[in-house]
């Protein structure tokens, strides 16, 4: 079965710093979303080989990519306190598959000692349930993102 390996499980960074999240799969996917979990999950990026990536406007000018959709590293720059949260990779395959999640803790520089990551991965219960449908979603319409490629700061 298709799996998404995601790292790191957790990272603590000061305001203004950058963080790398890596999503790796065994291939055979259409594309990959990075989704911020929460009461209203939000798609942060959509990446597909050969397609101009899409980035949510909140991250305008703050995202970089390296690698390919099978082994993608996403860099988020100039982190803000409001960026704190759990980010999960979602591979678009015949059945959507989720990574284990990365908890990003953005802290004020002075209070870094107060917030530390444990070694345990984010709790699985925090992840959304996989979709029931098996049809390939169309990333042009299915995402919370407006149609992929449509602005930001880098197509």
């Amino acid at each position: 079965a298709q799996e998404v390996q995601q790292s790191p499980h957790c990272t603590t960074v000061p305001v203004g710093a950058s963080v790398n999240i890596t999503c790796s799969t065994s291939g055979g996917l259409r594309g990959i979303y990075l989704r911020q979990l929460g009461p209203q999950p939000q798609d942060i990026i959509y990446y597909e080989d050969g397609v101009v990536p899409t980035t949510d406007r909140r991250f305008r000018g703050r995202i970089d990519f390296s690698g390919s959709q099978d082994n993608l590293t996403i860099t988020m720059h100039r982190l803000q306190l409001s960026d704190t949260g759990t980010y999960t990779c979602q591979a678009i395959t015949e059945v959507n598959v989720y990574g284990s999640g990365t908890l990003v803790l953005v802290t004020e520089e002075q209070s870094q000692g107060w917030h530390r990551c444990s070694d345990a991965p984010p709790r699985a219960s925090a992840l959304p349930a996989p979709p029931t449908g098996s049809a390939l979603p169309d990333p042009q319409t299915a995402s919370a993102l407006p149609d992929p490629p449509a602005a930001s700061a880098l197509p």
Partner: antibody, heavy 125, light 107 residues
Framework: EVQLVESGGGLVQPGGSLRLSCAAS????????MSWVRQAPGKGLEWVSS????????FYADPVKGRFTISRDNSKKTLYLQMNSLRAEDTAVYYC??????????????????WGQGTLVTVSS | EIVLTQSPATLSLSPGERVILSCRVS??????LAWYQQKPGQAPRLLIY???NRATGIPARFSGSGSGTDFTLTISSLEPEDFAVYYC?????????FGGGTKVEIK
Amino acid sequence: EVQLVESGGGLVQPGGSLRLSCAASGFTFSRYAMSWVRQAPGKGLEWVSSISASGATTFYADPVKGRFTISRDNSKKTLYLQMNSLRAEDTAVYYCAKDQDFDILTGYLNWFDPWGQGTLVTVSS
Amino acid sequence: EIVLTQSPATLSLSPGERVILSCRVSQSVSSYLAWYQQKPGQAPRLLIYDTSNRATGIPARFSGSGSGTDFTLTISSLEPEDFAVYYCQQRRNWPLTFGGGTKVEIK
């Protein structure tokens, strides 16, 4: 007012090198992607390369891949295009262009708006 | 590579006439199509983005429509300053590509 001023064009022999610069003003340069687009004399527009706001991610058109390098110095508010192994078919006016400034949109690369006035590169022996 | 085909290559018209320019795309680009205007000796200027949105400062006589693979730019009534070359561009896939352009000239 946003301003983009290209420089560095000129006459160069086939196989030679040239570095184009694009000095930006009137906006927060470090927050926007930038691109190079060229236009051969009497011809249409051809996208050459784009670079993310941080400079860490770059994209190239196949005809220039491996020969051209896009880069930026955000502290100097300047975009560069290093052109090596130049060929006659690289002869063109080279424009730098800023990512469109619309917060209502999302995406990693937006439309080209505005453009600089262009600088002419002529590759000939 | 996505190929954009503009037609006609040249249009000879008079001020006040209505203009419809076509841009046909080799595969779907959703709504990720823009139109630029270029006058002789000048840099291109963004007119329409995401198929139908007018860029800042662009007069209402310019409008865009279409979806998928067929797009049009309409100028409701040609003004003397509208005589120029018009290019469409997609940014759905790499590489970013432009159409060959349509020249709108004075009859």
